[in-house]
Interface confidence: low
């Protein structure tokens, strides 16, 4: 698989990648919060509040090519990458490189995908092979999640996601995966 780089709208260079993002390392094991300096508890956060609108995380648009073995999408797809730590919305910069970036004292807030959409792409293959079609999951929105005390992979608390979710009784766009999952990119699934 090639790793051809290209630009996204945040002027970052993004390599060509497969479908699935990868969870951050601190979600990979259950020892993250069980460090001696924390006494097994998440560090105190002065910005914790019941007002979920206080919390936000950065949604960066980027483009990438979808690959399946030697085949590559005819056009790049655009999706979001959920960026970094979460903090109060009023302290998050609107543009990359401007303003101060608030970081909590420990890795217990994460900005992760909230909803997905599915997009059909055409893959072009070398050697005169017929083009293939492929559906891919693309991140449609991000959300803040706080790791809870003695967390495991599924013990994550939501912050301010209700507004982004489809209302009950209302069907979201066809193929919209109202899900939440993972983050930096990984292997092709095939």
């Amino acid at each position: 698989q090639g790793w051809q780089a290209f630009k996204n709208d945040a002027t970052e260079i993004i390599p060509e990648l497969g479908e699935y993002p990868e969870p951050p390392p601190e979600l990979e094991n259950n020892k993250t919060m069980n460090r001696a300096e924390n006494g097994g508890r998440p560090p105190h956060h002065p910005f914790e509040t019941k007002d979920v609108s206080e919390y936000s995380c950065r949604e960066l648009h980027f483009t990438r090519y979808v690959t399946d073995g030697p085949c590559r999408s005819a056009k790049p797809v655009t999706e979001l990458v959920c960026s970094g730590q979460c903090g109060p919305a009023r302290l998050l910069p609107n543009a990359i490189g401007r303003g101060k970036w608030w970081r909590p004292s420990g890795p217990d807030f994460r900005c992760i995908p909230d909803r997905y959409r599915a997009q059909r792409v055409q893959l072009l293959c070398p050697g005169g092979e017929a083009p293939r079609a492929r559906k891919v999951r693309l991140v449609a929105s991000c959300k803040c999640k706080r790791l809870t005390r003695f967390h495991n992979q599924s013990e994550l608390k939501d912050f301010g996601t209700e507004a982004a979710r489809p209302q009950k009784g209302r069907k979201p766009r066809p193929r919209a995966r109202s899900a939440k999952a993972n983050q930096a990119e990984l292997e092709n699934a095939y």
Epitope: K135, K145, L156, R177
Partner: antibody
Amino acid sequence: QVQLVESGGGLVQPGGSLRLSCAASGFTFRSHWLSWVRQAPGKGLEWVSVITPYGDTYYADSVKGRFTISRDNSKNTLYLQMNSLRAEDTAVYYCARDTYLHFDYWGQGTLVTVSS
Amino acid sequence: DIALTQPASVSGSPGQSITISCTGTSSDVGDINDVSWYQQHPGKAPKLMIYDVNNRPSGVSNRFSGSKSGNTASLTISGLQAEDEADYYCSTYDGPGLSEVFGGGTKLTVL
């Protein structure tokens, strides 16, 4: 090559509990969505539950509140904790890898029989 | 919610072609190319045969093909062989419930 191997099935009384495991190998486990699908004797396939790489979980209405799907990425293992089992939960339970919104690899299945 | 309807049984002679239909109650099935087909032999796990309506995974014979028209997806098996005798299930993704929906299955008998 990709392999999924289920275990933990058996005979259990109504109201009882059982925990199924699915050991995975041959792929980057932590990056994939994983599902449980079941098949009652002589019946069709029924999706049961899915877990995302972050551990978020979704369930069929028929098992909601009784079944819990989970994963241990360090052990490359998927689990299904089944509580308050009913006769209608009797089925072969398959774990399946969810790739590009379809199931490209399946385990061989493990039989769960709920009977008194 | 999406529901998929398949014929309970289909039969054909060796060498013939047969088609199994899968009709969706929702326009989603027609609008989005997202139907998969699985083959299941008795006592065995299902095997992915077709995905995204008409794509074959590597290792699946080119005798198997998929298509769709409106709300109906179809699986066609040409040059029918004895080993094709099995149950076939169509499925699609149900966005609102984040679930996979299966058709009731079709038993293919090779005469």
